[in-house]
Interface confidence: medium
């Protein structure tokens, strides 16, 4: 059974899931970014269903083309390299969906944006941090 | 190898419709933008359009919006253009191409395969 | 839609000679241009995209440059296998569009 101290630290994981995946959506929709009608033309995939934390399997599989997407923006836009950025975003993925089970993601027919593909994440880390407090 | 191969040559009448077609092989085909060019006789390129098939989202230039359209069959890997009535004035080279990218996935950037092309000819 | 320009219309030149090909756009296009060479009766051939970035595969005496509205295409040796019209293309905003052509020969 989950600890109360278990449950803050993931709580603690999931808020920093959180404010990565805003720091990213603020970056990208920076008015003066000339890139985003470029970045807006990737398509990305979304889990069919996503209500878990073994579900992060989806968000974890699509890092390797957010960091691509992400290299288009100015880096003036971020704090971070790209490369560092999901680097970490990738390290509290995996130690929030666990490593013990192997979990094969379902995909959505319907592909996405980047701005919709991070707003699905957020809204998803959201609704755990609600379940947790 | 990466290849788009077009349907043949056709010779229509005005007023008559057609679908031509470019099957994508070597690579997956719902993740890259195909984009339609026109070339008339002895002319340049035409940007006409551009479809994603694993949506299905397409993009066309004003010029050419309603005066064709772009579709695509991801299960068969095919894209098409088609005329519900055709012109003289369309007479034409055809390419289909393929948008290049990163991580197996593309988003606007250069064509960087191309159909063979698929000449037509509307003449009455 | 943005409007791209070419200029020469067409050139002669000898082999081993350094030809220049430039492209405007209309409006500033940051480096989102791509050059493509068409030999006759073949579909096109991408070189160079984002004004620069030469294509896997193409030979090193092609180079791009520029950025904003002003670009450069150059052939810095050229061969007699490289006669062919060369088209610059934007694809910084929808709809993409193309230069008229500069059509390359051999004098």
């Known amino acids: 059974a989950p600890t109360s101290s278990s449950t803050k630290k993931t709580q603690l994981q999931l808020e920093h899931l959180l404010l990565d995946l805003q720091m990213i959506l603020n970056g990208i929709n920076n008015y003066k970014n000339p890139k985003l009608t470029r970045m807006l033309t990737f398509k990305f995939y979304m889990p069919k269903k996503a209500t878990e934390l073994k579900h992060l399997q989806c968000l974890e599989e699509e890092l390797k083309p957010l960091e691509e997407v992400l290299n288009l923006a100015q880096s003036k836009n971020f704090h971070l390299r790209p490369r560092d950025l999901i680097s970490n975003i990738n390290v509290i993925v995996l130690e929030l969906k666990g490593s013990e089970t192997t979990f094969m993601c379902e995909y959505a027919d319907e592909t996405a944006t980047i701005v919709e593909f991070l707003n699905r994440w957020i809204t998803f880390c959201q609704s755990i941090i609600s379940t947790l407090t | 190898e990466v290849q788009l191969v077009q349907s043949g040559a056709e010779v229509k009448k005005p007023g008559e419709s057609l679908k031509i077609s470019c099957k994508g092989s070597?690579?997956?085909?719902?993740?890259?933008?195909i984009g339609w060019v026109r070339q008339m006789p002895g002319k340049g390129l035409e940007w006409m359009g551009i479809?994603?098939?694993?949506?299905?989202?397409?993009k066309y230039s004003p010029s050419f919006q309603g005066q064709v359209t772009i579709s695509a069959d991801k299960s068969i890997s095919t894209a098409y253009l088609q005329w519900s009535s055709l012109k003289a004035s369309d007479t034409a080279m055809y390419y289909c191409?393929?948008?290049?990218?990163?991580?197996?996935?593309?988003?606007?950037?250069?064509?960087?395969?191309w159909g063979q092309g698929t000449a037509v000819t509307v003449s009455s | 839609d943005i409007q791209m320009t070419q200029s020469p219309s067409s050139l002669s030149a000898s082999v081993g000679d350094r030809v220049t090909i430039t492209c405007q756009a209309s409006?500033?296009?940051?480096?989102?241009l791509n050059w493509y060479q068409q030999k006759p009766g073949k579909a096109p051939k991408f070189l160079i995209y984002?004004?620069?970035n030469l294509e896997t595969g193409v030979p090193s005496r092609f180079s791009g440059s520029g950025s904003g509205t002003d670009f450069f295409f150059t052939i810095s040796n050229l061969q007699p296998e490289d006669i062919a019209t060369y088209f610059c293309?934007?694809?910084?905003?929808?709809?993409?569009?193309f230069g008229p052509g500069t059509k390359v020969d051999i004098k």
């Open positions: 293309q934007q694809d910084d905003n929808l709809p993409f569009t």
């Open positions: 479809i994603y098939p694993g949506d299905s989202d397409t």
């Open positions: 191409a393929r948008h290049g990218g990163y991580s197996g996935r593309s988003y606007y950037y250069g064509m960087d395969v």
């Open positions: 070597g690579y997956r085909f719902t993740n890259y933008w």
């Open positions: 409006q500033d296009i940051s480096n989102y």
């Open positions: 984002d004004a620069s």
